[in-house]
Interface confidence: medium
Amino acid sequence: PTGAVEVQVPEDPVVALVGTDATLRCSFSPEPGFSLAQLNLIWQLTDTKQLVHSFTEGRDQGSAYANRTALFPDLLAQGNASLRLQRVRVADEGSFTCFVSIRDFGSAAVSLQVA
């Protein structure tokens, strides 16, 4: 591919109530013949790049963020890289980046507001 992977997230912040679950939506467009073995997906805090969740080498590497995050494994192959953040806390508020690498890479940031 000559261009970066196109990663799409909602423009508007995701608003969640304390204690509820929030879905940080992120999607990419898989090319024909794409397989999950090619995918490197990294969710990180935008400002510090602290690792939140990752998927690589064909498998979910799990949560690195207080064990409160999950991917949607059945939807990854279709380009759905969304992250589920459970039991939202006030301290979770901020920007999360979805970083997708297949051969090239792309990233986009989604904001979480806690009410």
Partner: antibody, heavy 116, light 108 residues
Framework: QVQLQESGPGLVKPSGTLSLTCAVS?????????WNWVRQSPGKGLEWIGE???????NYSPSLKSRVTISIDKSKNQFSLKLNSVTAADTAVYYC?????????WGQGTLVTVSS | EIVLTQSPGTLSLSPGERATLSCRTS???????LAWYQQKPGQAPRLLIY???SRATGIPDRFSGSGSGTDFTLSISRLEPEDFAVYYC?????????FGQGTKVEIK
């Protein structure tokens, strides 16, 4: 295909300020990427200096933080490095690079010598 | 900060031989947070491997990466003349991002 090109003076006097600019072509600097500066002293390894996000958020190496400023000019599709109070130890090849995590691509590098 | 230690410092091999380069991190990191670069004299580093094992665009399959935790390896299955260079590992699991000191692969 994103390409990066460093420019700036090749000679800086001790105690002066090193100023470099990195021009980004083939893509927008406003995309969700960090834009980095890395340096390599003669015959030595690579040292990350710092990075800037299009929003203006910056992260710097703790060892250089007190002397470094990285800025971004989205209208010119470029970002810049300023390193003040330089000494001979700051003589190095300075590279700019795109990278959220790993660095790719890199500029070709520019040698900056600190000498009177 | 996370310190990366590469070994050996220099590897003297002949074309066609296998090269095995080691990178050890001072703290355990997720493998997705490690990259390898190749640098030839007078050139900028070139990304080879990211995520510990994924080859960057255009990198031949004789290059492979592996490892987890604190121990990572870059392997070159059969050295070609153009592979003689310095190789660096880099972690991006925490700030500041740091590099190893490099391993020089030279012709024996």
């Amino acid at each position: 295909q994103v390409q990066l090109q460093e420019s700036g003076p090749g000679l800086v006097k001790p105690s002066g300020t090193l100023s470099l600019t990195c021009a980004v072509s083939g893509g927008s600097i406003s995309t969700s990427n960090y834009w980095n500066w890395v340096r390599q002293s003669p015959g030595k390894g690579l040292e990350w200096i710092g990075e800037i996000y299009p929003t203006g958020n910056t992260n710097y190496s703790p060892s250089l933080k007190s002397r470094v400023t990285i800025s971004i000019d989205k209208s010119k599709n470029q970002f810049s490095l300023k390193l003040n109070s330089v000494t001979a130890a700051d003589t190095a090849v300075y590279y700019c690079a795109r990278g959220w995590n790993w660095f790719d691509p890199w500029g070709q590098g520019t040698l900056v010598t600190v000498s009177s | 900060e996370i310190v990366l230690t590469q070994s050996p410092g220099t590897l003297s091999l002949s074309p066609g031989e296998r090269a095995t380069l080691s990178c050890r991190t001072s703290q355990s990191i997720n493998g997705i947070l490690l990259a390898w670069y190749q640098q030839k004299p007078g050139q900028a580093p070139r990304l080879l491997i990211y995520g510990a094992s994924s080859r960057a665009t255009g990198i031949p399959d004789r290059f492979s990466g592996s490892g987890s935790g604190t121990d990572f390896t870059l392997s070159i299955s059969r050295l070609e003349p153009e592979d003689f260079a310095v190789y660096y590992c880099q972690q991006y699991g925490s700030s500041p991002r740091t590099f190893g000191q490099g391993t020089k692969v030279e012709i024996k």
